[in-house]
């Protein structure tokens, strides 16, 4: 009830239009499975409106339910490459704070060279999302093949 | 009813609820890789609220950040068909105005018969989105297998 | 600016923030292809805000256009398993009321072990969505591998 009353005075930003779409910057060294992201109009069509990047990982600034989506395409890949290097797996999760660490979304490549999915999940201010690509195959940096984003949906 | 009353102070259009979900109409002639779309309640569950169709291609009417999504299933397909006819690739991009031409989303079928993905991207009034299917395999027109849509998310 | 001013008259509920994200509870007996879902904060990161569950199937409470999304991962699966048990197909549709029965979204696994997709579709209060998995392979109950959700987008 408190929210509905407060809502009457709320400008656009307070509706929580937090949204981000990121492009791949680089992968980590051998023992670090994380993908490192970048975003901003100078880089093309990526952007951050609300969330921020912290050392290439996405940090949430507003509590709420978010639609999280990702697509990752492997750089050198055919169906035989993908199956020979199996398992190659992509997982999106909350990696910090440690107390909230959890895997949100997980897919394996099997005989494909691209994975794409999306889900709704509650996120809290300060949650940092990590995207872990396990295996030896490397992702493409083409901005139409590999991207990661979140969209605030409701409180 | 309360919604309708409250709504009187906020014209729906001003919220920017532009949204469209399209079904496949037909493919182009041999040298034209574009898919041609159709939408409207008479056709089933497809619709256009804001965006318009221009010769089967989707034209945006409101500036903003959009969620673009697509699923395409090949009509006569098994994993062996898909791999034998590789590369079969689907790309969604801005095809006009020419000055804004760019590929937004790209996927290959490899050994699969369906691709599905989604992404957030800034679009401007007048942008026309094209969906190019390259290769010799044809898409299914079943409305639950092949569809393409956009949803306005924020200014 | 008009948006921010007009916003003062529109309470939260009237915006129609109906949203749900479900996790797999169980599959049906041999002759029942439906997946049975569950949701709620006690179960983890699943939730229902507006829609309800009716014997494990999702029932819509508000008319509008919805984004429907799903990911299903097969439990014991490799690309050879998936191709040997082909066709394994997932379909999302309105299963009741019978007068509105229709398939909304359909994908086959072919040589993959995960399907994921999403689409926009009009749904009406009382529509019940069913997710049918045909074939002999069983879905994973891991909450990051198999999930199903809807998000109200506009009236």
């Amino acid at each position: 009830q408190r929210f509905a009353q407060a809502q009457q005075q709320l400008p656009l930003e307070s509706l929580g239009w937090d949204v981000a779409e990121l492009q791949l910057n680089h992968t980590g060294p051998q023992q670090d499975p994380r993908l490192y992201w970048q975003g901003g109009p100078a880089l093309g069509r990526s952007f951050l409106h609300g969330p921020e990047l912290d050392k290439g990982q996405l940090r949430i600034h507003r509590d709420g339910i978010y639609m999280v989506h990702i697509q990752v395409t492997l750089a050198i890949c055919s169906s035989t490459t993908a199956s020979r290097h199996h398992p190659t797996t992509l997982a999106v999760g909350i990696c910090s704070p440690a107390s909230r660490s959890i895997s949100l979304l997980r897919l394996s490549f099997h005989q494909g060279c691209t994975i794409a999915s999306q889900r709704l999940t509650p996120l809290a201010r300060g949650d940092t999302l990590c995207t872990n690509l396990t295996g030896t195959l490397l992702p493409s940096r083409n901005t139409d093949e590999t991207f990661f984003g979140v969209q605030w949906v409701r409180p | 009813q309360r919604f309708a009353q409250a709504q009187q102070q906020l014209p729906l259009e001003s919220l920017g609820w532009d949204v469209a979900e399209l079904q496949l109409n037909h493919t182009g002639p041999q040298q034209d890789p574009r898919l041609y779309w159709q939408g409207g309640p008479a056709l089933g569950r497809s619709f256009l609220h804001g965006p318009e169709l221009d010769k089967g291609q989707l034209r945006i009417h409101r500036d903003g950040i959009y969620m673009v999504h697509i699923q395409v299933t090949l009509a006569i397909c098994s994993s062996t068909t898909a791999s034998r006819h590789h590369p079969t690739t689907l790309a969604v991009g801005i095809c006009s105005p020419a000055s804004r031409s760019i590929s937004l989303l790209r996927l290959s079928f490899h050994q699969g018969c369906t691709i599905a993905s989604q992404r957030l991207t800034p679009l401007a009034r007048g942008d026309t989105l094209c969906t190019n299917l390259t290769g010799t395999l044809l898409p299914s027109r079943n409305t639950d297998e092949t569809f393409f849509g956009v949803q306005w998310v924020r200014p | 600016q008009r948006f921010a001013q007009a916003q003062q008259q529109l309470p939260l509920e009237s915006l129609g923030w109906d949203v749900a994200e479900l996790q797999l509870n169980h599959t049906g007996p041999q002759q029942d292809p439906r997946l049975y879902w569950q949701g709620g904060p006690a179960l983890g990161r699943s939730f229902l805000h507006g829609p309800e569950l009716d014997k494990g199937q999702l029932r819509i409470h508000r008319d509008g256009i919805y984004m429907v999304h799903i990911q299903v991962t097969l439990a014991i699966c490799s690309s050879t398993t998936a191709s040997r048990h082909h066709p394994t197909t997932l379909a999302v549709g309105i299963c009741s009321p019978a007068s509105r029965s229709i398939s909304l979204l359909r994908l086959s696994f072919h040589q993959g072990c995960t399907i994921a997709s999403q689409r926009l579709t009009p749904l009406a209060r009382g529509d019940t969505l069913c997710t049918n998995l045909t074939g002999t392979l069983l879905p994973s109950r891991n909450t990051d591998e198999t999930f199903f959700g809807v998000q109200w987008v506009r009236p």
């Epitope: 791949l24 910057n25 680089h26 992968t27 980590g28 060294p29 051998q30 490397l138 940096r141 | - | -």
Partner: nanobody
């Protein structure tokens, strides 16, 4: 601006070896990866080997186990060691960075008896 110059191509018999070099005008550490591509007339350019700035490598199926990509970071040079060459390896080989730059002249490799 980055410029890349390929060298080391030539004619070699099946089963033979060649070493291609790619000299970069700026530090190769500034790129996500540098890759070797090849193109046969009438076909799309294919990425056959890549090495990231932190030393991770990937190879196309067709060359794995026969080709090795490496770097000399002091000289800003990327190498492609090609062994057990086959007639189907005949192509023009190019190196390029990601983010990509203009394509160079390439190095012609011909495998024939």
């Amino acid at each position: 601006q980055l410029q890349l110059v390929e060298s080391g191509g030539g004619l070699v018999q099946p089963g033979g070896s060649l070493r291609l070099s790619c000299a970069a005008s700026v530090s190769i550490f500034t790129f996500y990866f540098i890759g070797w591509y090849r193109q046969v007339p009438g076909k799309q350019r294919e990425l056959v080997a890549l090495i990231t700035s932190n030393g991770r490598t990937n190879y196309a199926d067709s060359v794995e186990g026969r080709f090795t990509i490496s770097t000399d970071t002091a000289r800003n040079t990327v190498f492609l060691e090609m062994k057990s060459l086959k007639p189907e390896d005949t192509a023009v080989y190019y190196c390029n960075a990601d983010p990509s730059t203009d394509w160079g002249q390439g190095a012609q490799v011909t495998v024939s008896s």
